[in-house]
Interface confidence: medium
């Protein structure tokens, strides 16, 4: 049997026998283009492709449309994998999205969506989510129906303001909505009453900026 040498996601890597968390090279669907991603092989059975991670404020998330499209940061630390890759990947197969959150008081919570995909760039990478479960709120902090993605140089939100410019970071802003995991990073003791922080409203309420976040995806049939 010929060994698989290209992988489209971390689930394929896990199933190939590589079960250690770390940075791996993934290949765009129907292409030879490659991208580096962090694979979490430990959480909930492993095989998770990490598409976003915040932990210390070391990376600036107030980036352009092009940067959010292509990805930025370091997969070993804070990073955004890239909207184009995620859109192509989730358009080929049914994926689940898990969002892990940490506050500054040592608490952890998660939201799990049983179907997640991003529309293509022509639809501004609009987010589609269904089937919320988890401990980070009974109501989705990503507005439903899904919004278009907005950045500081591409305003696609439903607000009379420009959410990305005001709240910082690229996100699926509504008007401006109950979440922004790409907001300004605030250290402990400076993380409350912050309108432009890392927000997940239906877990921590208004103005609370989180300590750490991870967004990761895995095939629904893993």
């Amino acid at each position: 049997k010929e060994e698989q040498t290209t992988f489209r996601d971390c689930a394929e890597i896990f199933k190939s026998g590589l079960t250690t968390s770390g940075i791996y090279t993934l290949t765009f669907p129907n292409s030879t283009e490659e991208i580096k991603a962090y694979c979490d092989m430990d959480v909930g059975g492993g095989g998770w492709t990490v598409i976003q991670h915040r932990e210390d404020g070391s990376v600036d998330f107030q980036r352009t449309w092009k940067e959010y499209k292509e990805g930025f940061g370091s997969p070993l630390g804070e990073y955004w994998l890239g909207n184009e890759f995620v859109s192509q990947l989730t358009g080929q197969h049914r994926y689940v999205l898990k969002i892990q959150l940490k506050d500054w008081e040592g608490n952890e919570a998660h939201s799990l969506y049983d179907h997640f995909y991003l529309a293509g760039e022509e639809s501004n990478y609009r987010i589609h989510l269904t089937g919320l479960t988890g401990t980070a709120g009974k109501i989705s902090s990503i507005s439903q129906p899904g919004s278009d993605f907005s950045t500081k140089d591409s305003d696609n939100d439903k607000c009379i303001c420009k959410c990305s410019q005001m709240l910082s970071g690229g996100w699926w802003f509504d008007a401006c909505g109950p979440s922004n995991l790409n907001g300004q990073y605030y250290p402990q003791k400076q993380n409350t009453n912050k309108f432009n922080g890392i927000k997940w409203y239906y877990w921590k309420g208004s103005g609370y900026s989180l300590k750490a976040t991870t967004m990761m995806i895995r095939p629904a049939d893993f």
Partner: antibody, heavy 120, light 111 residues
Framework: QVQLVQSGAEVKKPGSSVKVSCKAS????????ISWVRQAPGQGLEWMGR????????NYAQKFQGRVTITADESTSTAYMELSSLRSEDTAVYYC?????????????WGQGTLVTVSS | NFMLTQPHSVSESPGKTVIIPCTRS????????VQWYQKRPGSAPSIVIY?????PSGVPDRFSGSIDSSSNSASLTISGLKTEDEADYYC?????????FGGGTKLTVLG
């Protein structure tokens, strides 16, 4: 629990201006948008505009553009709505309102209303 | 900008169910959340449904909201009508130009 307390009733002459205040307590005033909505006698609710105090940015409904000015004073947690060139059709109850969610365009908390009567 | 159209009035007997529709004139009803407000004479409006179907704490579960993409409309349903439900009801949505209210529906509880 956010509370909004508005200034008292006003009687104004046509062509003049009115300034209504709205004092907030029990929440984070700066980062929550304050909207102004009016209801004329026998009419429905009409959104006029809003301000995000922390940014000092106001947005107005097209109908009122150029005639309404919404401001906020963070030090006193007070928002203001000034309407100029008053005419009889501006006779209405004016409400300030806000949301428990920063900026979101729906309105969980309302002031008690301020009656503005425009009459010669 | 889009408009939200509601019937001018509806009436029903106590204990019955009433449905108040709100039709969006252009753009999808699903593209922005719909809220519903109750307005009694002499009082400020109060929100009874937000985000299409969520009910704020303190609002009885007799009140429910829904949206129907096929008719491009939202609906407020009040079951087990009580006399205190008599009021004006307004739907509300928004887009990148601002907030839009429906014209309001006067609910009369008969008897």
């Amino acid at each position: 629990q956010v509370q909004l307390v508005q200034s008292g009733a006003e009687v104004k002459k046509p062509g003049s201006s009115v300034k209504v205040s709205c004092k907030a307590s029990g929440g984070t005033f700066s980062s929550h948008a304050i909207s102004w909505v009016r209801q004329a006698p026998g009419q429905g609710l009409e959104w006029m505009g809003r301000i995000i105090p922390i940014l000092g940015i106001a947005n107005y409904a097209q109908k009122f553009q150029g005639r309404v000015t919404i401001t906020a004073d963070e030090s006193t947690s007070t928002a203001y709505m000034e309407l100029s060139s008053l005419r009889s059709e501006d006779t209405a109850v004016y409400y300030c309102a806000t949301s428990r969610l920063e900026w979101l365009l729906y309105l969980d908390y309302w002031g008690q209303g301020t009656l503005v009567t425009v009459s010669s | 900008n889009f408009m939200l159209t509601q019937p001018h009035s509806v009436s029903e007997s106590p204990g019955k169910t009433v449905i108040i529709p709100c039709t969006r004139s252009s753009g999808s009803i699903a593209s922005n959340y719909v809220q519903w407000y109750q307005k009694r004479p002499g009082s400020a409006p109060s929100i009874v449904i937000y985000e299409d179907k969520q009910r704020p704490s303190g609002v009885p579960d007799r009140f429910s909201g829904s949206i129907d993409s096929s008719s491009n409309s939202a609906s407020l349903t009040i079951s087990g009508l009580k006399t205190e439900d008599e009021a004006d009801y307004y739907c509300q949505s928004y887009n990148s130009r601002g907030v839009m209210f429906g014209g309001g529906t006067k609910l009369t509880v008969l008897g």
